[in-house]
Amino acid sequence: IVLRPSRVHNSEENTMRALTLKDILNGTFSYKTFFPNWISGQEYLHQSADNNIVLYNIETGQSYTILSNRTMKSVNASNYGLSPDRQFVYLESDYSKLWRYSYTATYYIYDLSNGEFVRGNELPRPIQYLCWSPVGSKLAYVYQNNIYLKQRPGDPPFQITFNGRENKIFNGIPDWVYEEEMLATKYALWWSPNGKFLAYAEFNDTDIPVIAYSYYGDEQYPRTINIPYPKAGAKNPVVRIFIIDTTYPAYVGPQEVPVPAMIASSDYYFSWLTWVTDERVCLQWLKRVQNVSVLSICDFREDWQTWDCPKTQEHIEESRTGWAGGFFVSTPVFSYDAISYYKIFSDKDGYKHIHYIKDTVENAIQITSGKWEAINIFRVTQDSLFYSSNEFEEYPGRRNIYRISIGSYPPSKKCVTCHLRKERCQYYTASFSDYAKYYALVCYGPGIPISTLHDGRTDQEIKILEENKELENALKNIQLPKEEIKKLEVDEITLWYKMILPPQFDRSKKYPLLIQVYGGPCSQSVRSVFAVNWISYLASKEGMVIALVDGRGTAFQGDKLLYAVYRKLGVYEVEDQITAVRKFIEMGFIDEKRIAIWGWSYGGYVSSLALASGTGLFKCGIAVAPVSSWEYYASVYTERFMGLPTKDDNLEHYKNSTVMARAEYFRNVDYLLIHGTADDNVHFQNSAQIAKALVNAQVDFQAMWYSDQNHGLSGLSTNHLYTHMTHFLKQCFSLSD
């Protein structure tokens, strides 16, 4: 059980106050983290509170400013990047968001040696992506879907690609679906370790159907936004990978990397690229039916100036029970011999673990094992491998950092974080300097987050980087809800849940219950992390009990739970929320006449289906930006879990799993449907179709749209949204305003 320590003593009770909605909307109780921007084994950069760029040397304990806030302000810079030779800094301004990761910006190059901005051959604007080479100060950038190279910032650019075209051909940057569902980055180009070669992807979207929606703006006529967006079963982007020698880019030009034959025989995806050395690269490919992945190691052939990917260096990863990987197929971490690697994939018992691959996947040596999962490999050095897992004390919603000594035999394992601040910190990530000489640990909870710096050899804590003292002080007079993380055992399924309880919770009383659900494949909601958010307020001020439940399809508890939803989205996720609610009622403190459910995105889909389940359990519920039919969502995501919407594949379940098919069942619940009209991700079309089905069934419901807002409903819309949802729930639960 994880209980937030209650600071309420009777004598102090009158000075304590509940959280308000205003607190949440103002971000009064937000926390800070500290991720060093490592530039060597013992140095990092950090932007100070007053916006100076400061270099810290761990070994001297000294810091000095390398770039002043005055220089930053002179071009209104909001971000920076130091060249590896430390001669130049790019300054980023005019940030303009595009999709989840992508944005355009204006870039200025500042020469630290002379304290001047580089004049002559300035960069065009706006730039879609820009990065330094890993050594020296070469620049690669993407402008108008084409890639350019500069040997030095003041040099004229060398144009690498010429076929880039808006919404048609993308070079060095992903199209919409690759950005959101495959790469999870704004870039699709990768420098080799010493900057000799530059690899890049070309995405051809010429034949992809386009989603079009109105952007109302302020003009007399709305604009139409057009995005090549492959929905389930539609034509997909065609991807090619090229590599160019950046020292002599004009010599042979970009060379295409061959696709493995077993992949190229039908529709496929490129999933990631990992450089091993300057002349060895590793590409990962995936069949469109995403249960077969191929990792291909390719070598540069000097004589032909081409890239060779021998079949003997192809490693196949296949799932027989679901899709390949977790959310994504994991990426390899190569060892110092530049051919063997470490990778996370399912073991014979169906748990994701670290394996060491020397020659073939069949001969892989399993490095970790148990009824828990390895989650991320952070760093492999000559003698240590650092990774995170949820092994400790068998809580799937925790993350601890471990070190395996691979230099000794047999390898020994040490938990670096398990006992550091055991009550406060149970969910960590880490950031390592070169050669893992030092590392930062960032603890996200369940207590107030704290970031610390550690010695990579001894694991000794060197200093606290950020401990959120102001937040701690601000919370001293706040009645925070209590939180507990427990599990239910139901029909051989373990359902972990987090319950958020009002500050003066009394088991003998009855409370309204709100279920917050996401429930998407390979997600996890029950995590030991700190948060003061909307549901904290609902518990603290409005006296609600809030519960989050990780049911079938969720991650990090083995393949049986994860792949249970394969080809049947919308069934078990909903069943498990309902089962949990029944168990909560049995606990005796839930008012069964006042139960609600809400969710956003995939959670909006699940909450809608739960409301329309016909169980009579839910009085009301909210769906924000829900998917309503899997035929409306992106191919890469949807087909991973559902297969294709064709008669000979899985069309029947595509049709059976829509929200619209259950329109009649909404008659006996209060339903609030919310969506942004400019949602590029889950299109407004989804909610439009729900609304149409409800109208056609003559079912009353409430709705709210947010004009020109995307999937995040940000800015002033956020305030309006949470205020609106609060009123809706208080009305549903008969709570006075």
Epitope: G41, E43, N57, E59, R86, Q87, K437
Partner: nanobody, 116 residues
Framework: QVQLQESGGGLVQPGESLRLSCAAS????????MGWYRQAPGKEREWVAG???????NYADSVKGRFTISRDNAKNTVGLQMNSLKPDDTAVYYC??????????WGQGTQVTVSS
């Protein structure tokens, strides 16, 4: 305030060698990344070479393979061995942190002239 004193410059012929030295008045240099910079007549100051506290080196393309940066932490000095010198290497050479400390005045430097 740490003082950095450059020395070792002079007049040499093309193809010859020269060794520059930089002495720091405080122990700060031995544990910080240090660099050599140069400024040719009528040109902007440019970076030449850098070395981190654990001896990792980095060079500008124009001097790669000809210049070698080194450090002696015990003596608190940073050196620059310059081989196969060219007329283009003619400049005033400066020693500083790498990257340079913002707003800190540069030293006097040491003049290197490569001429036949």
């Amino acid at each position: 305030q740490v003082q950095l004193q450059e020395s070792g410059g002079g007049l040499v012929q093309p193809g010859e060698s020269l060794r520059l030295s930089c002495a720091a008045s405080g122990s700060i240099s031995s544990r910080n990344a240090m660099g050599w910079y140069r400024q040719a007549p009528g040109k902007e100051r440019e970076w030449v070479a850098g070395i981190t506290s654990d001896g990792i080196t980095n060079y500008a393309d124009s001097v790669k393979g000809r210049f070698t940066i080194s450090r002696d932490n015990a003596k608190n000095t940073v050196g620059l061995q310059m081989n196969s010198l060219k007329p283009d290497d003619t400049a005033v050479y400066y020693c500083n942190f790498w990257p340079p400390l913002y707003g800190r005045p540069w030293g006097q430097g040491t003049q290197v002239t490569v001429s036949s």
